[in-house]
């Protein structure tokens, strides 16, 4: 058993049929010695008396808010949550496996630049009695600070018969060094509590591996005289790290016909302009990627040829 | 470059960008080892990293690029030695046309651009990683190239910025 926060405790249980469970001793936080009784949740049934209560925690029915009283007055509370371990693996019932980029991916994170700011998100089908708390650090043995905000519900989607809820959190490394080569990964830890079930999820990454620039901005076409060619130009996204002579991007320019089956013409360039042939009803799209490290491409910025 | 002269920024920029390309093309070819969730120890603690105080940021380069260039040179020599070691030359053999050979030569080329014959910066000892099994070599190749990708990305940014802002 360990303390999650004041008066909230997590009991770690090996979860299998007829498991013996864990013996837990609760102590009433009071100077009083006599006349103390214990109850669980809203029930008035007295579970025991005395300053300590010993219970055998085996299942969710044994978890909940234990309260010690004296003469009708509440002295203190202890909330017990359960953390299930099945076959040596902690349960992951609360969050959905996003399966990208690999199985058992519950947390996904992205950064728009090298400033040390990043966003993580996760999915669940649970709509109520759900709380999240997020902590982060750079490295684990001698951790350097990363500050995370509160997790918020950022999207709701309908998936078949189910509703899916997306939560996200923004974090910022306290002393980020954008130009340095990272040697210790960022660690992100999410505590999830659903009713009386506790679970924790972790992710470990380098900022360089989760970079995804915003799409190029101000995408414009300039027809070239007496030609089907156009000059496409664009700019670095505002959110990208500066100076651009140091934090350089590379770009992919694509000409795509109306039909998805039509052949796509693609050009790669380090410049912020390119000359392409504009076909009727086609569109021109541009996306960006770090020039020197193959992290994710940005989403496409697009304009119609006409 | 030692003694404060300026490097051939544009040449260094071109070669470092080539190194980036080679490091990424070599990576999947060293032998597939699916190591997603493995590696609770940092393999690359022993390798030289370009750290915050090394003056490789735009401001540090403007003030005095020598500290940064020395750090980059150290790293290039270090990785050049690793790529020439038993880790990459031992079993399992790399294919004759593997980009690792080009990568090795390019690391040497860039280090020589930074330190012509007759000048000497101190270099870092390469650690004894001592893989005795072929799959241990495979694992280390995988991790060394991952680490090299990060190192050459920073070096390429330094030379691109130098070529754009510090070239005479």
């Amino acid at each position: 058993i360990w303390e999650l926060k004041k008066d909230v405790y997590v009991v770690e249980l090996d979860w299998y049929p007829d498991a013996p469970g864990e013996m837990v001793v609760l102590t009433c936080d009071t100077p009083e010695e006599d006349g103390i009784t214990w109850t669980l949740d809203q029930s008035s049934e007295v579970l025991g008396s005395g300053k300590t209560l010993t219970i055998q925690v085996k299942e969710f029915g044994d978890a909940g808010q234990y309260t010690c009283h004296k003469g009708g007055e509440v002295l203190s509370h202890s909330l017990l949550l359960l953390h299930k371990k099945e076959d040596g693996i902690w349960s992951t019932d609360i969050l959905k496996d996003q399966k990208e980029p690999k199985n058992k991916t519950f947390l996904r994170c992205e950064a728009k630049n090298y400033s040390g700011r990043f966003t993580c998100w996760w999915l669940t089908t649970i709509s109520t009695d759900l709380t999240f708390s997020v902590k982060s650090s750079r490295g684990s043995s001698d951790p350097q600070g990363v500050t995370c905000g509160a997790a918020t519900l950022s999207a709701e989607r309908v998936r078949g018969d189910n509703k899916e809820y997306e939560y996200s959190v923004e974090c910022q490394e306290d002393s980020a060094c954008p130009a340095a080569e990272e040697s210790l990964p960022i660690e992100v830890m999410v505590d999830a509590v659903h009713k009386l079930k506790y679970e924790n999820y972790t992710s470990s990454f380098f900022i360089r591996d989760i970079i995804k620039p915003d799409p190029p901005k101000n995408l414009q076409l300039k027809p070239l005289k007496n030609s089907r060619q156009v000059e496409v130009s664009w700019e670095y996204p505002d959110t990208w790290s500066t100076p651009h002579s140091y934090f350089s991007l590379t770009f992919c320019v694509q000409v795509q016909g109306k039909s998805k089956r039509e052949k796509k013409d693609r050009v790669f360039t380090d410049k912020t302009s390119a000359t392409v042939i504009c076909r009727k009803n086609a569109s021109i799209s541009v996306r960006a990627q770090d020039r020197y490290y193959s992290s994710s491409w940005s989403e496409w910025a697009s304009v119609p040829c006409s | 470059v030692p003694g404060g002269s300026s490097p051939a920024w544009t040449q260094c920029q071109q070669l470092s960008q080539k190194l980036c390309t080679l490091a990424w093309s070599a990576h999947p070819l060293v032998g597939h080892m699916d190591l997603r969730e493995e590696g609770d120890e940092e393999t690359t603690n022993d390798v030289p990293h370009i750290q915050c105080g090394d003056g490789c940021d735009p401001q540090g380069l403007r003030d005095n690029s020598q500290f940064c260039l020395q750090r980059i040179h150290q790293g290039l020599i270090f990785y050049e030695k690793l790529l020439g070691s038993d880790i990459f030359t031992g079993e399992p053999s790399l294919l004759p046309d593997s980009p690792v050979g080009q990568l090795h030569a390019s690391l040497l080329g860039l280090s020589q651009l930074l330190q012509p014959e007759g000048h000497h910066w101190e270099t870092q000892q390469i650690p004894s990683l001592s893989p005795s099994q072929p799959w241990q070599r495979l694992l280390l190749r995988f991790k060394i190239l991952r680490s090299l990708q990060a190192f050459v990305a920073v070096a390429a940014r330094v030379f691109a910025h130098g070529a754009a802002t510090l070239s005479p």
Epitope: - | G31, H32, M33, D34, L35, E37, E38, G39, D40, E41, E42, T43, E91, P92, S93, L129, P131, S132, Q133, P134, W135, Q136, L138, L139, L140, K143
Partner: antibody, heavy 119, light 111 residues
Framework: QVQLKESGPVLVAPSQSLSITCTVS????????ISWVRQPPGKGLEWLGA???????NYNSALKSRLSISKDNSKSQVFLKMNSLQTDDTARYYC?????????????WGQGTSVTVSS | DIALTQSPASLAVSLGQRATISCRAS??????????MHWYQQKPGQSPKLLIY???NLESGIPARFSGSGSRTDFTLTINPVEADDVATYYC?????????FGGGTKLEIK
């Protein structure tokens, strides 16, 4: 599909030599290492030695002086030679494929050949 | 040589229950964060078959009832739920150092 087939079975007199050939199909000896493993009747498994993709070998130190492994890539064959056999060398001898990307795990096994050392 | 000690030597489990087999190494078999420990199943009269490689990776075609965990010196093979077809002897093996040693085996039976 991947297959490994050992020659035999073999009956050997004590102090004599043993030769087994393993013929593989469905993969190339240029890309995979081969190990030999034996199992005495009713007992556990013992690794004997391996031949790498490049032709290098390594052997169980306890048997090194009596053991030799070689191969012919063009014929997809691996050879095990063992001399000075004693009765405790009686076992089922398996030819096994080792996968480097699996960390040297043995992902395909032959059906084994029975070797009996008896006078 | 690295000695691998498997326990228990034999195990009887009811159908649908969980079987846990332990393998302890005499020295660490981690190399830069990767554990070169593998698990095999050998049914009577058959050749061994790879189940788990590098401590926790399930070989393709093996049911997800089989799982491996552990690192350094302590490793576990779990079968949950056990089926009648799982009656066999299970071996652990390390390939971190040669000679590549096997555990003594654990015989699984149905109660």
């Amino acid at each position: 599909q991947v297959q490994l087939k050992e020659s035999g079975p073999v009956l050997v007199a004590p102090s004599q030599s043993l030769s087994i050939t393993c013929t593989v199909s469905g993969f190339s000896l240029n890309n995979f290492a081969i190990s030999w493993v034996r199992q005495p009747p009713g007992k556990g498994l013992e690794w004997l030695g391996a031949i790498w993709t490049g032709g290098g070998t390594n052997y169980n130190s306890a048997l090194k002086s009596r053991l030799s492994i070689s191969k012919d890539n063009s014929k997809s064959q691996v050879f095990l030679k063992m001399n000075s056999l004693q009765t405790d060398d009686t076992a089922r001898y398996y030819c096994v494929r080792k996968d480097y990307s699996y960390g040297g795990a043995m992902d395909y096994w032959g059906q084994g050949t029975s070797v009996t050392v008896s006078s | 040589d690295i000695a691998l000690t498997q326990s228990p030597a034999s195990l009887a489990v009811s159908l649908g229950q969980r079987a846990t087999i332990s393998c302890r190494a005499s020295e660490t078999i981690n190399f830069y964060g990767t554990s070169f420990m593998h698990w095999y199943q050998q049914k009577p009269g058959q050749s061994p078959k790879l189940l788990i490689y590098r401590a926790s990776n399930l070989e393709s075609g093996i049911p997800a009832r089989f799982s491996g965990s552990g690192s350094r010196t302590d490793f576990t093979l779990t079968i949950n739920p056990v089926e009648a077809d799982d009656v066999a002897t299970y071996y652990c093996q390390q390939t971190n150092e040669d000679p590549y040693t096997f555990g003594g085996g654990t015989k699984l039976e149905i109660k």
